[in-house]
């Protein structure tokens, strides 16, 4: 004979367990139905009647199949340094994550953050060695010879000094090199400033002293946008 399908509640065979989405009620000594996510057990089962489930009230939830007598309370509202990335519903808790520019210094369960901290900024002469993540702060490092950073930022890395035909002012850790130049190195470099005398700006690598130049030069180009390459530095 085919095995009969047992309807809850039912007494399990000795040594066997209840099926999926059922639980064993110690009092009734029966396998009974669990409540679905978003519900809780309003009345527990007996030998003759199954579990009675009810929906979670506002601001409470259950995420799993369960037989809890009360739904769990959703976490408190997200703080000002957080963003609600998952709303509180009957089936899931609210999740608060740190807003951009912040990272989670102390996390709770379920992906929420207990304490957010502002990402550190690397000052001039320092660049980002390791970017900040959702759970870790920025790590800064001094700009190596031939590179620079002239910003205070949690994202900017040290950039190479620009290459110059003739170096007017050598670059250093916090400043790009300034080139003696007859024309800008960038098509309409944003924010480029032309001075009456020669120079261009982006950076280099070597040590500091301007280069002697035999080339005519007519304008100074001071950089205020992206800056590139170099490796040793002094001035030509």
């Amino acid at each position: 004979l085919p095995a009969q399908v047992a309807f809850t509640p039912y007494a399990p065979e000795p040594g066997s367990t209840c099926r999926l989405r059922e639980y064993y009620d110690q009092t009734a000594q029966m396998c009974c139905s669990k409540c679905s996510p978003g519900q809780h057990a309003k009345v527990f089962c007996t030998k003759t009647s199954d579990t009675v489930c009810d929906s979670c009230e506002d601001s409470t939830y259950t995420q799993l199949w369960n037989w809890v007598p009360e739904c769990l309370s959703c976490g408190s509202r997200c703080s000002s340094d957080q963003v609600e990335t998952q709303a509180c519903t009957r089936e899931q808790n609210r999740i608060c994550t740190c807003r951009p520019g912040w990272y989670c210094a102390l996390s709770k369960q379920e992906g929420s953050c207990r304490q957010c901290m502002r990402l550190s900024k690397c000052g001039p002469g320092f660049g980002v060695a390791r970017p900040g993540t959702e759970t870790s702060d920025v790590v800064c490092k001094p700009c190596a010879p031939g590179t620079f950073s002239n910003t205070t930022s949690s994202t900017d890395i040290c950039r190479p000094h620009q290459i110059c035909n003739v170096v007017a002012i050598p670059g250093n850790a916090s400043m790009d090199a300034v080139c003696t130049s007859t024309s800008p190195t960038r098509s309409m470099a944003p924010g480029a400033v032309h001075l009456p005398q020669p120079v261009s700006t982006r950076s280099q690598h070597t040590q500091p002293t301007p280069e002697p130049s035999t080339a005519p030069s007519t304008s100074f180009l001071l950089p205020m946008g992206p800056s590139p390459p170099a490796e040793g530095s002094t001035g030509d």
């Epitope: 031939g146 890395i157 950039r159 190479p160 000094h161 620009q162 290459i163 110059c164 035909n165 003739v166 170096v167 050598p170 090199a177 080139c179 130049s181 007859t182 024309s183 800008p184 190195t185 960038r186 098509s187 309409m188 470099a189 944003p190 280099q204 690598h205 070597t206 040590q207 002293t209 301007p210 280069e211 002697p212 130049s213 035999t214 080339a215 946008g225 992206p226 800056s227 590139p228 390459p229 170099a230 490796e231 040793g232 530095s233 002094t234 001035g235 030509d236």
Partner: antibody
């Protein structure tokens, strides 16, 4: 007429050294950055190193930093590339090139190239 | 892998117009840096073809033209000739690197 003439290439064993030279004429040598650019057999162009006109500032690709040294003698209108700790992947034709007027990031004149082969 | 991206090959028949693209990013072409183009005929050294996006050195025919927009640039060759068969490379400065960066090169074949 601008002319750039490289020399010094050849066959060298891995770990060995070689010094390339580039004789320049036809322009005011000390007023321009000079570059070395290489091209592995059947491959594309790769910038290697540069030096400012007054020889005070040098620039290197990460792939050669610490192994190659660029220099120039403005009195002789000559550019050099000292290559140490050579590797098989350094095998290429090495070109010397002149930085452009007002913008050293382009090369308005190139030499004919010299072949460097690193092999045991 | 090259910092600037070019199609590996392109082709056209004599008299046709062919365009070669060069795609970069916000740290090179998109940062406002000029794009330069080089032509390398078989067995010879590269030669400057276009500088500062659209400028032609003296001696380069006006059949060659360059343009730039956003994070990409293109080289156009009109009235294609058999002697245009060569490798073409784009190049630009990049904020994060010490020297100019090149595209991987495009081999142009003139058919027929």
């Amino acid at each position: 007429e601008v002319q750039l003439l490289e020399s010094g290439g050849g066959l060298v064993q891995p770990g060995g050294s070689l010094r390339l030279s580039c004789a320049a004429s036809g322009f005011t040598f000390s007023s321009y950055a000079m570059h070395w650019v290489r091209q592995a057999p059947g491959k594309g162009l790769e910038w290697v190193s540069a030096i400012s006109g007054g020889a005070t500032t040098t620039y290197y690709a990460d792939s050669v930093k610490g192994r190659f040294t660029i220099s120039r003698d403005n009195s002789k209108n000559t550019l050099y590339l000292q290559m140490n700790s050579l590797r098989a992947e350094d095998t290429a034709v090495y070109y010397c090139a002149k930085g452009g007027t007002g913008d050293p990031y382009y090369f308005d004149y190139w030499g004919q190239g010299t072949l460097v082969t690193v092999s045991s | 892998q090259s910092v600037l991206t070019q199609p590996p090959s392109a082709s056209g028949t004599p008299g046709q117009r062919v365009t070669i693209s060069c795609t970069g990013s916000s740290s090179n072409i998109g940062a406002g840096y000029d794009v330069h183009w080089y032509q390398q005929l078989p067995g010879t050294a590269p030669k400057l073809l276009i500088y500062r996006n659209n400028q032609r050195p003296s001696g380069v025919p006006d059949r060659f033209s360059g343009s730039k927009s956003g994070t990409s640039a293109s080289l156009a060759i009109s009235g294609l000739r058999s002697e245009d068969e060569a490798d073409y490379y784009c190049a630009a400065r990049d904020d994060g690197l010490s020297g100019p960066v090149f595209g991987g090169g495009t081999k142009l074949t003139v058919l027929g």
